[in-house]
Amino acid sequence: EEELQVIQPEKSVSVAAGESATLNCTATSLIPVGPIQWFRGVGPGRELIYHQKEGHFPRVTPVSDPTKRNNMDFSIRISNITPADAGTYYCVKFRKGSPDVELKSGAGTELSVRAK
């Protein structure tokens, strides 16, 4: 049995330009201790979309549901979507360290942007 699962339930999300996109992610546990971060794309060139403690992400709002008793919610909402936001977004769990170590990624959610 896996100690930690990172679940992105939607494979894809389609949003009209100018609207907001909600990207869902849950983890089965806070343990191991360490942050959840959101990225667009994979590999060394991936773009950091949201970090819970560091950086400034004015278009991104955490939208967790704390009533979910059986898991931890790390969902985000991105406002004012433009075609440039299209891509696959990954919710990634890190283990706290110096530096933090990437532990597990969700399967990804592909965001497509429709014309207004």
Epitope: L30, P32, V33, T61, S64, P66, N70
Partner: antibody, heavy 118, light 112 residues
Framework: EVQLVESGGGLVKPGGSLRLSCAAS????????MSWVRQTPGKGLEWVAT????????YYPDSVKGRFTLSRDNAKNSLYLQMNSLRAEDTAVYYC???????????WGQGTTVTVSS | DIVLTQSPASLAVSLGERATISCRAS??????????MHWYQQKPGQPPKLLIY???NLESGVPDRFSGSGSRTDFTLTINPLQAEDVATYYC??????????FGGGTKVEIK
């Protein structure tokens, strides 16, 4: 019904060792993060140790790090706290507690008393 | 370490009235919009019992006269109306991703 039953407490001299056990039933033990929390009249409640559901990750506060070791046997639905180099300040009631998500302590055992005294 | 300061240390309230307990954290315990602050009730000779998880969520089986509120650093547990069986000591606890996890010093609730 969820049950957590601690055992292994007792009187021990400073510098001595004790092994506490916690027997779990009534829930899927292997899915839960498990912890020990202790309580003293002077210091109140203090988190002592936590172990991930599969046993890979363990965490301790500085007050017990290097002296206490937490382990689990999911096949036996059991949790163990090995306490070495015990000090007078380790005297407390020790509670075994479960954490489904590694967050709040869902269920607590009745506790076992550890007294460190010469 | 995140220090949790509970106030008052003790509280005497008349039956049927409101009891309010405060817990202040030395730094934010919020992550992704969830406040990792929890409340427990402990009666003499018994272990603590979870009442409220993640600031405001009532644990299953807990009477709805208990409620929790707050975010970031300031949290409140309210018992309204207070009943005789609520005489106990109440503790707040934070489980943010900053170890060590810590507890408040407790608030003893008695009947006036």
């Amino acid at each position: 019904e969820v049950q957590l039953v601690e055992s292994g407490g007792g009187l021990v001299k400073p510098g001595g060792s004790l092994r506490l056990s916690c027997a779990a039933s009534g829930f899927t033990f292997s899915s839960y993060v498990m912890s020990w929390v202790r309580q003293t009249p002077g210091k109140g409640l203090e988190w002592v140790a936590t172990i991930s559901s599969g046993g890979t990750y363990t965490y301790y506060p500085d007050s017990v790090k290097g002296r206490f070791t937490l382990s689990r046997d999911n096949a036996k639905n059991s949790l163990y706290l090995q306490m070495n180099s015990l000090r007078a300040e380790d005297t407390a009631v020790y509670y075994c507690a479960s954490q489904l998500t590694g967050s709040e302590f869902d269920y607590w055992g009745q506790g076992t008393t550890v007294t460190v005294s010469s | 370490d995140i220090v949790l300061t509970q106030s008052p240390a003790s509280l005497a309230v008349s039956l049927g009235e409101r009891a309010t307990i405060s817990c202040r954290a030395s730094e934010s315990v919020d992550l992704y919009g969830t406040s990792f602050m929890h409340w427990y009730q402990q009666k003499p000779g018994q272990p603590p019992k979870l009442l409220i998880y993640r600031a405001s969520n009532l644990e299953s089986g807990v009477p709805d006269r208990f409620s929790g509120s707050g975010s970031r650093t300031d949290f409140t547990l309210t018992i309204n109306p207070l009943q005789a069986e609520d005489v106990a000591t109440y503790y707040c606890h934070q489980s943010s991703d900053e170890l060590p996890w810590t507890f408040g010093g407790g608030t003893k609730v008695e009947i006036k």
